[in-house]
């Protein structure tokens, strides 16, 4: 896996251990946690992100209305189980043996039951919509500056191709950035909108996963743009299946 | 308009030091980075290092450290770069340039007119 | 460190011809590649960045192009003012590092 020949590091990842133990001396670099192998030249899951978080030491209208099944990520932190490949296992399981099924992004999106809970399949989040408010600027911010400018940073920073941001929509303060990729649309080596989203949002949040590139600073035409809330909303490609007590 | 005005040229002697200064205008000074490049006689263009001017933070390239020294004033919005125990082969322009605080901002869209430090005994 | 060679060192063309300068770096680093100009005694200039986005002010007949390891600077149509050295810079990740250059030289 290519990572920094030179001092052996990952600039796609920093919660990685490196050595110069690959094949022909080659910088190798496991993550923290799994202990697997990634490839640097790209973004790293986002379940191995974090399960290596959590072995670390703690320390008029055009804005888009969330549908009805949009899942925000409540849960908050959990040690997740990842597959071989990295990916979320469907079914995610507590110390407590208590289960529930996630999707592809590693949120929960069943009621919680026990061990005999089945999670028959991992089903895609094809749409994610990045919610953003911005500080007070002079003036609203150009629109396709801010769409031309959040574009180029999804495809250089996160490597997505620009055809998975869908939309970039803006209603001063509010930014919202929406990302689409069904099963169908997804080739080899393209990166996973739910592992861009979670760069991004851990970039905004100032805790960026990067190495030796400094943290996000984002500019339209010059301009800082800085966000001060952020809510991400996914969505299935089958809706997700919670009991009527949980939506009252 | 936005502007980078650096200090005059300098003739040093070998083991003596420098310090170039910078001087920002146009823009504030805290929402772009500095970074340091050098160009020695009929050769190409080096990296130095480069200053977060927000954080403070200087960060420099590895056949430097040890002889350099990025920083910057905020309230006069000046960056200055200070090299020690100068060589022969120190002997180029030294450049200035803006730049973003992120790598997706790494290149440099305004640059200084260039100091020459030039040593010799 | 990533290491960006850029070819060829030297180019001769004429005012109109189409030119394309190469540039190679040591490792992917996504899109992030910028192109500059530099006249004799003068500081250099931002033509292009993030590969393919030129910058403010920068003629049309400057285009860049690529992204991981394989990038190129086309223009289309030399005019008299373009016989410059280029270089090219990856703005990936520290240490930050530039081509060798390209002289272009008139024919």
């Known amino acids: 896996h290519t990572a920094a020949q030179d001092n052996c590091t990952c600039p796609t990842n920093k919660m990685t251990v490196c050595s110069p133990d690959g094949p022909g001396g080659r910088c190798q670099c496991r993550a923290l946690g799994s202990g697997m192998a990634v490839d640097c030249s790209t973004l790293t899951s986002k379940c191995l992100l974090l399960k290596a978080r959590m072995s670390a030491p703690k320390n008029a209208r055009t804005l888009v209305r969330p549908s009805e099944h949009a899942l925000v990520d409540n849960d908050g932190l959990y040690d997740p189980d990842c597959d071989p490949e990295g990916r979320f296992k469907a079914r995610q399981c507590n110390q407590t043996s208590v289960c529930w099924c996630v999707n592809s992004v590693g949120v929960r999106r069943t009621d919680k039951g026990d061990l005999s809970l089945r999670c028959d399949e991992l089903v895609r989040t094809h749409h994610i919509l990045i919610d953003l408010r911005h500080r007070p600027t002079a003036g609203a911010f150009n629109h396709s500056d801010l769409d031309a400018e959040l574009r180029r940073l999804f495809r250089e920073r996160y490597r997505l191709h620009p055809k998975f941001v869908a939309a970039v929509h803006y209603e001063q303060p509010t930014i919202q950035i929406e990302l689409r990729q069904n099963t169908s649309q997804k080739a080899a080596g393209d990166v996973d909108i739910g592992d861009a989203a979670y760069y991004f949002e851990r970039d905004i949040k100032g805790e960026s996963l990067f190495q030796g590139r400094g943290g996000l600073d984002l500019r339209v035409r010059g301009e800082p743009l800085q966000v001060e809330r952020t809510l991400i909303y996914y969505l299935d490609e089958i809706p997700p299946k919670f009991s009527m007590k949980r939506l009252t | 308009q936005v502007q980078l005005v650096q200090s005059g040229a300098e003739v040093k002697k070998p083991g003596a030091s420098v310090k170039v200064s910078c001087k920002a205008s146009?823009?504030?000074?805290?929402?772009?980075?500095m970074q340091w490049v050098r160009q020695a006689p009929g050769q190409g263009l080096e990296w130095m290092g480069w200053?977060?001017?927000?954080?403070?933070?200087?960060k420099y390239a590895e056949d430097f450290k040890g002889r350099v020294t990025i920083s910057a004033d905020t309230s006069t919005s000046t960056a200055y770069l200070q090299l020690s125990s100068l060589k022969s082969e120190d002997t180029a322009v030294y450049y200035c340039?803006?730049?973003?605080?992120?790598?997706?901002?790494?290149?440099?869209?305004?640059w200084g007119q260039g100091t020459l430090v030039t040593v010799s005994s | 460190d990533i290491q960006m060679t850029q070819s060829p060192s030297s180019l001769s063309a004429s005012v109109g011809d189409r030119v394309t300068i190469t540039c190679k770096a040591s490792?992917?680093?996504?899109?992030?590649v910028a192109w500059y100009q530099q006249k004799p005694g003068k500081a250099p200039k931002l033509l292009i960045y993030?590969?393919?986005y030129r910058y403010t002010g920068v003629p049309s007949r400057f285009s860049g192009s690529g992204s991981g390891t394989d990038f190129t600077l086309t223009i289309s149509s030399l005019q008299p003012e373009d016989f410059a050295v280029y270089y090219c810079?990856?703005?990936?990740?520290?240490?930050?590092?530039f081509g060798q250059g390209t002289k272009l030289e008139i024919k």
């Open positions: 490792q992917d680093v996504s899109t992030a």
């Open positions: 146009g823009y504030t000074f805290t929402t772009a980075g």
């Open positions: 993030s590969a393919s």
């Open positions: 810079q990856h703005h990936y990740i520290t240490p930050l590092t």
């Open positions: 200053i977060n001017t927000h954080s403070g933070v200087p």
């Open positions: 340039a803006r730049s973003g605080h992120g790598s997706s901002y790494w290149y440099f869209d305004v």
